[in-house]
């Protein structure tokens, strides 16, 4: 379930601490509900960006099955449909740290209607 | 080239347990996530569990879950699927695989042990 | 969970000539980043599961480029453009977008 989510986010906030990564990421930091799961879908794009930069097995997995989790979770609520949301690359770019921020605060949403 | 030996299956009463081994070689074993896939006689194929490469983190079908555990072991190469509860319809030839990272090519299982067959029957 | 089921399943074709097997998922296989993991598999009589395909229509290296996959959504296609003698086998389909990962009942290729 999502509870999960974030502790993978954190497990991987963490990690990441101990290393030096500068990447920026699209972060979408003000999500409209109705453009929830194409937010989801550019935050995990980004995150196979993090796991690839790292080169980190421990961030590997992680990553790996917090994408896992996220495709179950979204696919047992069937297939949701959303138009007129941002392309990943409109999104604006900013830090590691900000884009995790901002990653559990759309998964929360996701608690927050389920 | 890539090599992937399972061991350890047989005879086992249903109820007993059994514990199968995949001795993998020729690449970076600690580099990838590896399946368990099984084949009871004359029928089909079922995937029965994945781990990660680090061994944190496991996936099971209903059908086993609960009674079978992966783990691995990177120090000796090995990979190893523990069985309890056996059933009848566990009865099958039991294939190690390697599996290819979503974030670098796509899931896939790309190499493929000889497969070890395991019994279950009184 | 996502049901695979395969078509036909047993395909008596002669040396030389195409063969194609349907693979249809019981629900879009498309995950949320987008990406379709449908895999196709040969097993050969008496040998282990061998790769073929992933990703839809990705032929892994190796593979003789007579097979091709194809397909989106919730319906996909092997085909085999002159089938050879050594094509002799079950073929099955596999979706890992998501867990429980599932395998079609497999399809029999044969030599008429």
């Known amino acids: 379930n999502w509870v999960n989510v974030i502790s993978d986010l954190k497990k991987i906030e963490d990690l990441i601490q101990s290393m030096h990564i500068d990447a920026t990421l699209y972060t979408e930091s003000d999500v409209h509900p109705s453009c929830k799961v194409t937010a989801m879908k550019c935050f995990l794009l980004e995150l196979q960006v993090i796991s690839h930069e790292s080169g980190d097995t421990d961030i590997h997995d992680t990553v790996e099955n917090l994408i896992i989790l996220a495709n179950n979770i979204l696919s047992s609520n069937g297939n949701i449909t959303e138009s007129g949301c941002k392309e990943c690359e409109e999104l604006e770019e900013k830090n590691i740290k900000e884009f995790l921020q901002s990653f559990v605060h759309i998964v929360q949403m996701f608690i927050n209607t389920s | 080239e890539v090599r992937l030996m399972a061991s350890g299956g047989g005879l086992v009463q249903p109820g007993g347990s059994l514990r199968l081994s995949c001795a993998a070689s020729?690449?970076?074993?600690?580099?990838?996530?590896m399946s368990w896939v099984r084949q009871a006689p004359g029928k089909g194929l079922e995937w029965v569990a994945t781990?990660?490469?680090?061994?944190?983190?496991?996936y099971y079908p209903d059908s086993v879950k609960g009674r079978f555990t992966i783990s691995r072991d990177n120090s000796k190469n090995t990979l190893y699927l523990q069985m309890n509860s056996l059933r009848a319809e566990d009865t099958a030839v039991y294939y190690c695989?390697?599996?290819?990272?979503?974030?670098?090519?796509?899931?896939?299982?790309?190499?493929w042990g000889q497969g070890t067959l395991v019994t279950v029957s009184s | 969970d996502v049901v695979m089921t395969q078509s036909p399943l047993s395909l008596p074709v002669t040396l030389g000539q195409p063969a194609s097997i349907s693979c249809r998922s019981s629900?879009?296989?498309?995950?949320?980043?987008?990406?379709?993991?449908l895999e196709w598999y040969q097993q050969r009589p008496g040998q282990s599961p061998r790769r073929l395909i992933y990703?839809?229509?990705n032929r892994f290296s190796g593979v003789p480029d007579r097979f091709s996959g194809s397909g989106s959504g919730t319906d996909f296609t092997l085909k085999i453009s002159r089938v050879e003698a050594e094509d002799v086998g079950v073929y099955y389909c596999f979706q890992d977008s998501f867990v429980p990962y599932t395998f079609g009942q497999g399809t029999k290729l044969e030599i008429k």
């Open positions: 781990i990660s490469r680090g061994g944190d983190y496991t």
């Open positions: 990703k839809v229509f």
């Open positions: 020729e690449f970076t074993f600690s580099n990838y996530a």
């Open positions: 629900q879009s296989i498309v995950d949320i980043t987008g990406n379709t993991y």
């Open positions: 695989a390697r599996r290819v990272s979503m974030i670098t090519g796509g899931w896939a299982m790309d190499y």
